[in-house]
């Protein structure tokens, strides 16, 4: 049978549990015939504090006075050392250093729900470092008392397991908590309360929302509450918002009308409850209800723009473009756009519903006066139509904005500036700045962007759909009644030297001069707006500097004549392209020998 102290004892005076700062006397004594075998004077008793030797003595017992022990547990071990043998463990003792409990503070009690049980919390104060038992006492009317003990390491909460009922809501109850350990005890100040003070209702449940006649303006929130609830507070917000709208209601009886919700918006709703105007506490917020409000017919009007393209002597192509309504204007899912095209004099009208696009192209005669109307429709109705008379937007030269410039403005922005037209500037009703990626061949499928500017503005920052190293064709229109004037410019937000030069695809001889033709540089290699092409030539096998001819860049141009070559001399020719950032590398080299006579 194992006995940790069969050879002797360790005694501690005055107690194993001491107040911080106290002194203890530790005695280690051997039991009879448990010393060293030969001569008792050879007994060497050693006292250890944890693993550190603090005292020793020859004989059957050892006394040691110990001071300055820290808070917590200290282990003392007594060992016997005999000559020519290992130390033998005699016995050990724990000494527990702590303090008496402080007075528990801020005792407060709560009953969660009318059917819940009373539970109290308090602040323990500083750690006693000892086992401290807490006893919670509750006394009520008719000398009723309840008591509960807490035996956990850290105790600052106890549930009585009893339920206060609303029979006499004004009856007083008093709670008190007492902390006890080996060094003392302390009680909190009493906390007195009534049923109404401490019952915290359960959060509302079964929250629902109803929209009468599927209308956002006739919306009622329903919920269920415990029976005694008098007050509610509602909070709600769009799901993408951080700010709550708050409403306080009295005697709502589980329903409330909401009047300020936006259509076609997902909202989050929560409700909290209270039993009394100024007593007790609010419940936790209910679980969230998420619900989408019904659609309403769109408000606002579409921003519509158009492009005209000449097809032949009798026909023209009209491309209409419009911007999506904002979420707050659409007030629902836009199902289609209705486009109506009408010849104003003859009265012929054509209506078409467009789904999935924000553009429409048609071909109309070049004669007659044409107008379009475009509106957006959701399940509840249509927006007011935007009406536009189709005119030649650039016809009035005197309305053309002057001195148009386009400059890079930070990352992926272009600042467009202009001067008002020469014609009475006050006649301008608005400016429209239009931009689209420059594509040789003027591809009408390229997306069109535009913004409207007030008549007193002479600049606009364009940033939508602007990419670095892409050249944009920018037009500024001045509109006045049924007239328009325009000016255009090329611009980019960021540029560098083109990645390649033009590819010469043909050199032909015409009356003593040559005509060079080339393929355009692919758009993705232009790296911005091209300013010039350069054609270089030199005699083959010559070390002289090449001659060059610089041609201003024009979108549609892809050939140029040179008439300064000598006949019957073989030349090497190549081309480069330039942006404002620099010159490209050489394109391909072609050799050519002019056959005709020199001029």
């Amino acid at each position: 049978k194992i006995d940790a102290c069969k050879r002797g004892d360790v005694t501690v005076k005055p107690s194993h549990v001491i107040l911080l700062g106290s002194t203890v006397n530790i005695t280690c004594s051997l039991k009879p015939r448990q010393g060293c075998f030969h001569y008792s004077r050879r007994n060497k008793l050693i006292l250890y504090k944890f693993d550190r030797r603090i005292n020793f003595h020859h004989g059957h017992s050892l006394n040691s006075q110990v001071t300055g022990l820290p808070l917590g547990t200290t282990l003392f071990v007594c060992k016997l050392a005999c000559i020519n043998s290992d130390e033998i463990q005699i016995c050990g003792a724990e000494i527990f250093v702590g303090v008496a409990p402080e007075q528990p503070q801020n005792l407060s009690c709560i009953q969660k729900g009318e059917q819940g049980t009373v539970a109290c919390t308090w602040e323990r104060g500083r750690d006693t470092h000892l086992y401290t038992e807490y006893t919670l006492q509750l006394s009520g009317p008719k000398n009723l008392t309840w008591q509960k003990q807490c035996k956990d390491i850290y105790c600052d909460y106890l549930d009585f397991g009893i339920n206060l009922t609303p029979e006499s809501p004004e009856s007083n109850f008093t709670a008190k908590v007492t902390a006890v350990n080996s060094l003392g005890s302390s009680s909190s100040l009493p906390s007195t309360f009534t049923f109404l003070d401490i019952v915290r209702p359960l959060p509302p449940w079964d929250i629902r929302i109803k929209f009468q006649k599927a209308s956002v303006s006739r919306c009622t929130l329903y919920w269920r509450d415990e029976g005694l609830v008098l007050l509610n507070r509602l909070r709600y917000r769009p799901s993408n918002s951080r700010l709550w709208n708050m409403v306080n209601v009295t005697k709502a009886k589980g329903r409330h009308d909401l009047l300020d919700l936006k259509p076609f918006t997902e909202y989050e709703f929560q409700i909290s409850s209270k039993l009394h105007l100024y007593k007790g506490s609010w419940s936790d917020w209910s679980e969230s209800l998420r619900a989408q409000t019904p659609e309403e017919e769109p408000t606002g009007m579409l921003d519509v723009w158009y492009m005209k393209r000449h097809i032949d002597y009798s026909r023209q192509q009209i491309s209409l473009f419009w911007k999506n309504l904002s979420v707050s204007e659409a007030r629902g899912k836009i199902l289609h756009y209705q486009v109506t095209l009408q010849e104003l004099t003859g009265g012929k009208a054509m209506t078409q519903n467009i789904t999935g696009h924000t553009s429409w192209t048609t071909v109309i005669p070049r004669t007659g006066n044409w107008a379009v109307a475009v509106s957006a429709a959701n399940s509840k109705g249509s927006s007011l139509p935007t009406r536009i008379n189709i005119m030649n937007l650039c016809e009035a030269g005197l309305l053309a904005p002057r001195q148009v410039s386009a400059n890079s403005e930070g990352m992926d922005n272009i600042l467009v500036t202009w001067q008002p037209p020469r014609k009475d500037p006050s006649a301008v009703q608005e400016y429209v700045v239009e931009w689209r990626e420059l594509h040789p061949g003027g591809d009408t499928q390229v997306p069109l962007n535009w913004l409207r500017s007030r008549p007193y503005n002479v600049s606009a920052l364009i940033s939508e759909n602007i990419k670095s190293y892409i050249c944009y064709e920018i037009r500024v229109y001045a509109l006045s009644g049924d007239q328009g004037g325009c000016s255009s410019i090329l611009g980019n937000s960021k540029h560098k030297a083109p990645l390649s030069g033009p590819h010469i695809n043909a050199i032909t001889e015409e009356k003593g001069s040559i005509l060079i033709s080339w393929n355009s540089i692919p758009v993705q290699e232009q790296m911005g707006c091209l300013l010039h092409y350069r054609i270089y030539w030199k005699e083959r096998d010559s070390n002289s500097q090449p001659q060059l001819c610089e041609i201003p860049y024009r979108v549609s141009q892809n050939s140029h004549p040179i008439n300064s070559l000598q006949p019957r001399v073989t030349y090497v020719l190549w081309m480069t392209a330039l942006t404002a950032a620099g010159e490209s590398s050489h394109g391909n080299e072609r050799e050519f020998c002019l056959q005709g006579k020199a001029n």
């Epitope: 194992i2 940790a4 549990v17 547990t73 282990l75 724990e94 000892l130 086992y131 390491i153």
Partner: nanobody, 125 residues
């Protein structure tokens, strides 16, 4: 997370002996106080014995002093309860517990963080 597994329970006649074992899953075992508690039907869980500091310190409930011996083998992460001179009133489910009691709270179940599932000891003729 320390897991504790008791074994060794069973039916024994009054005056007989049993040896309970409790194996711990982690080597942090040696840092903890290891205790045995028991719970008879309809009664609260009560302290039986505890061993701490690799066996230097032991405490026993008055009702078992001189009959039961607690010991531990830190190399095997195991604590033992040798029960001799068993009486019918020793009948209970015996639980092994590990933790670090504070002050003189070694006898309080709430001081211990980890518990085994328990093993039944029945003392009956």
């Amino acid at each position: 997370q320390v897991q504790l597994q008791e074994s060794g329970g069973g039916l024994v006649q009054p005056g007989g002996s049993l040896r309970l074992s409790c194996a711990a899953s982690r080597r942090t075992f040696s840092k903890h106080a290891m205790a045995w508690f028991r719970q008879a039907p309809g009664k609260e869980r009560e302290f039986v014995a505890v061993v701490r500091w690799s066996g230097i310190i032991t405490y026993y409930a008055d009702s078992v002093k001189g009959r039961f011996t607690i010991s531990r083998d830190d190399a095997k992460n195991t604590v033992y309860l040798q029960m001799d001179s068993l009486k019918p009133e020793d009948t209970a489910v015996y639980y092994c517990a590990a933790g670090d009691y504070r002050g003189n709270g070694y006898y309080v179940p709430g001081m211990y963080d980890y518990w085994g599932q328990g093993t039944q000891v029945t003392v009956s003729s």
